[in-house]
């Protein structure tokens, strides 16, 4: 007498489920359930999600749409795709910025902030990998610069001092005479 039997909805098409008193067709993506059907295998009353709300999937029981997320300006986020009735806002970083996850196990829904990409040119280095999902990967020093500690230092143009090997093209020729 527990009422554990859940009768199968024997309707044409497979997107029917018992809602209210009958098996009803669910609502399409971008619509919420206003009222269940009032006949076997009938159509539920579905309404379009209001502005700034969405439902991404076909559904039977959502009587309201989910609120669209706002991109976090404090974290320098921007909207890559605006919210629609069927999809949430897609937040990301503007060009020249990359995503820095705020948790160690990073997934698409993880909180993040945007960081400005390293400018390899300003560091006098080659750009090995352009910045997108992670920071720019800078390579070796540009011509006319040599490695010194952590940075790239401009090659000397005078012959008075020593001429580093990487700078032969700049100052080395003068030492041949």
């Amino acid at each position: 007498q527990g009422g554990t039997r859940s009768p199968r909805c024997d309707c044409a098409g497979d997107f029917h489920k018992k809602i209210g008193l009958f098996c009803c067709r669910g609502c399409p993506a971008g619509h919420y359930l206003k009222a269940p059907c009032t006949e076997p295998c009938g159509n539920s009353t579905c309404l379009v999600c209001p502005q700034d709300t969405f439902l991404a999937w076909e559904n039977h029981h959502n009587s309201e749409c989910a609120r669209c997320q706002a991109c976090d300006e404090q974290a320098s986020q921007v909207a890559l795709e605006n919210c629609s009735a069927v999809a949430d806002t897609r937040c990301g970083c503007k060009p020249g910025w990359f995503v820095e996850c705020q948790v160690s196990q990073c997934v698409s829904s993880s909180p993040f902030y945007c960081q400005p990409c390293l400018d390899c040119g300003a560091l006098h280095r080659h750009t090995r990998l352009l910045c997108s999902r992670r920071d720019t990967d800078c390579g070796t020093c540009l011509p006319g610069f040599y490695e010194h500690g952590d940075g790239c230092v401009s090659c000397p143009t005078s012959t008075l001092g020593s001429c580093p090997e990487r700078c032969a093209a700049v100052c080395g020729w003068r030492q041949m005479f």
């Epitope: 199968r8 209210g20 008193l21 098996c23 006949e39 076997p40």
Partner: antibody, heavy 120, light 111 residues
Framework: EVQLVESGGGLVQPGGSLRLSCAAS????????MSWVRQATGKGLEWVSA???????FYPGSVKGRFTISRENAKNSLYLQMNSLRAGDTAVYYC??????????????WGQGTLVTVSS | DIQMTQSPSSLSASVGDRVTITCRAS??????????MHWYQQKPGKAPKLLIY???NLESGVPSRFSGSGSGTDFTLTISSLQPEDFATYYC?????????FGGGTKVEIK
């Protein structure tokens, strides 16, 4: 054993209000759709309202806006709040359980009913 | 709303008789391969009791002398051999749509 026991009936003046209760036992109340059905003396049966297990309510036009069905699963109870009562609402009111094998409304257990008389 | 018309409104019969009650709906109550017609028995001062669901399915515990048939708008409840405990009023009910409606009843009396 499935049992449905109605209470709350009585004599009320036209325009008055009454709240009927139905105490359910012997089954998992929250899993079932429930209805109220009434029967005027010597007359046929008339469906009055239904409350589905997933929380939806349904009414015929004759009582919509005047009657409100509700349920309290924790108390295994079904209720019918009747407002703006008319002489035509005089009847025995039955609480009925919908069959769990059915994805359509058919009533497999009924209470013994409670009499509502609307008269001045 | 779907109107349900039962006939006859009353009948007299003897124990052992074959009894047929009909119910006509104002529009078809059949859809999606099913006929949404049900039958109840009610004895004086008692609550209704479900006999038949979906036009022809016998409810658990109901004697096999009761049977139902029909589709569309015309349905029949048959008692193959009337027993003393069968003297009662019988109602049809549809669940093809809301509101649910019942027939006016057929009273089966002892001849």
């Amino acid at each position: 054993e499935v049992q449905l026991v109605e209470s709350g009936g009585g004599l009320v003046q036209p325009g008055g209000s009454l709240r009927l209760s139905c105490a359910a036992s012997g089954f998992t109340f929250s899993n079932y759709d429930m209805s109220w059905v009434r029967q005027a003396t010597g007359k046929g049966l008339e469906w009055v309202s239904a409350f589905s297990s997933d929380g939806y309510t349904f009414y015929p036009g004759s009582v919509k806006g005047r009657f409100t069905i509700s349920r309290e699963n924790a108390k295994n109870s079904l209720y019918l709040q009747m407002n703006s009562l008319r002489a035509g609402d005089t009847a025995v009111y039955y609480c009925a359980r919908h069959a769990d094998y059915a994805n359509y409304p058919v009533m497999d257990y009924w209470g013994q009913g409670t009499l509502v008389t609307v008269s001045s | 709303d779907i109107q349900m018309t039962q006939s006859p409104s009353s009948l007299s019969a003897s124990v052992g008789d074959r009894v047929t009650i009909t119910c006509r709906a104002s529009k078809s109550v059949s859809t999606s391969g099913y006929s949404y017609m049900h039958w109840y028995q009610q004895k004086p001062g008692k609550a209704p009791k479900l006999l038949i669901y979906l036009a022809s399915n016998l409810e658990s515990g109901v004697p096999s002398r009761f049977s139902g048939s029909g589709s569309g708008t015309d349905f029949t409840l048959t008692i193959s051999s009337l027993q003393p405990e069968d003297f009662a009023t019988y109602y049809c009910q549809h669940s093809r749509e809301l509101p649910l409606t019942f027939g006016g009843g057929t009273k089966v009396e002892i001849k």
